[in-house]
C-alpha cells in the first residue's frame, strides 16, 4: 500500500448495545473502495491481545483472533466494497462490553474509529389483567433484564401519581444465572384508564401500556436503547 501511510480515510462508528444471548452488530462505515482485494478490516478490543476479527483480500482471516471470539464473528462480506465494515457478533456475552476499534486500510489510505459497546439484557414488557387478585390488578412481566432495572407505574388519569405504595416488584434470576425476569403487580386499578409499566436500566428503557375498558383491553409496548 504505497500511499496508505500518507492519506487518511474517514471511518465512522456508532455506540451500540448488545442483548446478552442474542446476536449483535458493532457498526462501522468507511469511504468505499471498489478494489475489494485492497481492503483490510481489523476489529480490536481494548485490553484483549489478538484481534476480534480480520477481513482482508476479500475474505476472513482469523489466524490472530482471540479465543473468546472464536466462532462468533463475521463481517457483511458483500457490503464491504460499499464501505460497510460492521461486525456481526453471535451470542453476545456480558464480557463483550468495552471499547472496540474499527481499523480500515484501503488503496486510498487508512483510518480508524472507536466505539463503546455496552452489554446487558432487555426485553419487551407484557401487561395483563390479573383476575386472580382479590381486587382488580395489573401484572407487568418482562423475561430478561440485566443489570437490575427500576420499575415504575404511571396512569393517564392520575398523572404524576406515585404508585410505589400500591405496587409490588420482584426480580427472579433466570436459569443462566445472569439475566432476571421482572414481575411487577399494580393493585386497585380502575377501568377506563390507561396504565404504563416502565422498566429501565442504563442500557434500555421499555414501556408497556394497557387500556382497560368495559368492553376491551388494548396493549402496546416499546423498547428504546439508551445512549446509542
Amino acid at each position: 500500500f504505497g500511499i496508505s501511510g500518507k492519506h487518511f480515510i474517514t471511518v465512522t462508528t456508532f455506540t451500540s448495545a448488545g442483548n446478552i444471548g442474542e446476536d449483535g452488530t458493532l457498526s462501522c462505515t468507511f469511504e468505499p473502495d471498489i478494489k475489494l482485494n485492497g481492503i483490510v478490516i481489523q476489529w480490536l478490543k481494548e485490553g484483549i491481545k489478538g484481534l476480534v476479527h480480520e477481513f482482508k483480500e476479500g475474505k476472513d482471516d482469523l489466524s490472530q483472533q482471540h479465543e473468546m471470539f472464536r466462532g462468533r464473528t463475521a463481517v457483511f462480506a458483500d457490503q464491504v466494497v460499499v464501505g460497510n465494515a460492521s461486525l456481526r457478533l453471535k451470542n453476545v456475552q456480558l464480557t463483550d462490553a468495552g471499547t472496540y476499534t474499527c481499523y480500515i486500510r484501503t488503496s486510498k489510505g487508512k483510518g480508524n474509529a472507536n466505539l463503546e459497546y455496552k452489554t446487558g439484557a432487555f426485553s419487551m414488557p407484557e401487561i395483563n389483567v390479573d383476575y386472580n387478585a382479590s381486587s382488580e390488578s395489573l401484572r407487568c412481566e418482562a423475561p430478561r433484564w440485566f443489570p437490575q432495572p427500576t420499575v415504575a407505574w404511571a396512569s393517564q388519569v392520575d398523572q404524576g401519581a406515585n404508585f410505589s405504595e400500591v405496587s409490588n416488584t420482584s426480580f427472579e434470576l433466570n436459569s443462566e444465572n445472569v439475566t432476571m425476569k421482572v414481575v411487577s403487580v399494580l393493585y386497585n386499578v380502575t377501568i377506563n384508564n390507561t396504565y404504563s409499566c416502565m422498566i429501565e436500566n442504563d442500557i434500555a428503557k421499555a414501556t408497556g401500556d394497557i387500556k382497560v375498558t368495559d368492553s376491551e383491553v388494548k396493549r402496546r409496548s416499546q423498547l428504546q436503547l439508551l445512549n446509542s
Epitope: D23, A74, N91
Partner: antibody, heavy 121, light 107 residues
C-alpha cells in the same frame, strides 16, 4: 465442488492412539472463511462433535474429550488430522470430518463419507 | 453444555403426510440451529441452517421454524426418499451439540 475424505486404520487396540486424516479436495483448507471439524457417531447412536481447527492451527475441543484429543493441520497437503489417545471400546464409532458454513455459522456442509474405527484387542 | 432434545424419537408416517419434528434447547440459542437428514450407512446431509434457511439443492417441502428454545422441522408432503433419521444441531455456543435423532419410518 468441495469434497472431504477420511482415512486411517479401521482397527485400534485399547489404550493406543487413534489417528485419522481428512483430505480436502476442490477447495483450499487455507480459506480463512471456514473452520474444519471432526464429528463421531457411535454405532446406532447419535452424533457427537469432537472439535474444530482453523487453517492457522488454532483449535477448540469438546471439553468431554479435551484431555485426549489433538488436532493438526497441514496446509501444504490440504489435510487436517485427529488424534485420540488412550482409546477404549467406547471410542468405537464412525468418524466424520466436515466443514462449517462460515466463521460464524457452523452448520456442517459438506461432510466426508465417514470411516468406521473399531477399538478392540 | 446445551442439551438438545428431539421429539418424537420415532415417527410412523405415510407418503403424502405432513410431518413435524420438534427440537428443544436447554437454553436459548437464538436462531443458531441446523437440521440434518441421515440415511443408513451415509453421512448426514444438511437441510436447514440458521433455523429456517433452506440449504441449496434441498427440496422446498422441507422447512424450519422457531427461535430461542423451540424449533420445528416440517416436511409438507412426505416423499419415499424422506424416510430417514433427522437430527438437529445447535451452533450457538461451544461445544456444539446434536439432538438424539428422530427416525421417520413407513407406517
Amino acid at each position: 465442488q468441495l469434497q472431504l475424505q477420511e482415512s486411517g486404520p479401521g482397527l485400534v487396540k485399547p489404550s493406543e492412539t487413534l489417528s485419522l486424516t481428512c483430505t480436502v479436495s476442490g477447495g483450499s483448507i487455507s480459506d480463512g472463511s471456514y473452520y474444519w471439524s471432526w464429528i463421531r457417531q457411535h454405532p446406532g447412536k447419535g452424533l457427537e462433535w469432537i472439535g474444530n481447527i482453523y487453517y492457522s492451527g488454532s483449535t477448540y475441543y469438546n471439553p468431554s474429550l479435551r484431555s485426549r484429543v489433538t488436532m493438526s493441520v497441514d496446509t501444504s497437503k490440504n489435510q487436517f488430522s485427529l488424534k485420540l489417545s488412550s482409546v477404549t471400546a467406547a471410542d468405537t464409532a464412525v468418524y466424520y470430518c466436515a466443514r462449517g458454513l462460515s466463521t460464524i455459522d457452523e452448520a456442517f456442509d459438506p461432510w466426508g463419507q465417514g470411516t468406521l474405527v473399531t477399538v478392540s484387542s | 453444555d446445551i442439551q438438545m432434545t428431539q421429539s418424537p424419537s420415532t415417527l410412523s408416517a405415510s407418503v403424502g403426510d405432513r410431518v413435524t419434528i420438534t427440537c428443544r434447547a436447554s437454553q436459548s440459542i437464538s436462531s443458531w440451529l441446523a437440521w440434518y437428514q441421515q440415511k443408513p450407512g451415509k453421512a448426514p446431509k444438511l437441510l436447514i441452517y440458521k433455523a429456517s434457511s433452506l440449504e441449496s439443492g434441498v427440496p422446498s417441502r422441507f422447512s424450519g421454524s422457531g427461535s430461542g428454545t423451540e424449533f420445528t422441522l416440517t416436511i409438507s408432503s412426505l416423499q419415499p426418499d424422506d424416510f430417514a433419521t433427522y437430527y438437529c444441531q445447535q451452533d450457538n455456543s461451544y461445544p456444539y451439540t446434536f439432538g438424539g435423532g428422530t427416525k421417520v419410518e413407513i407406517k
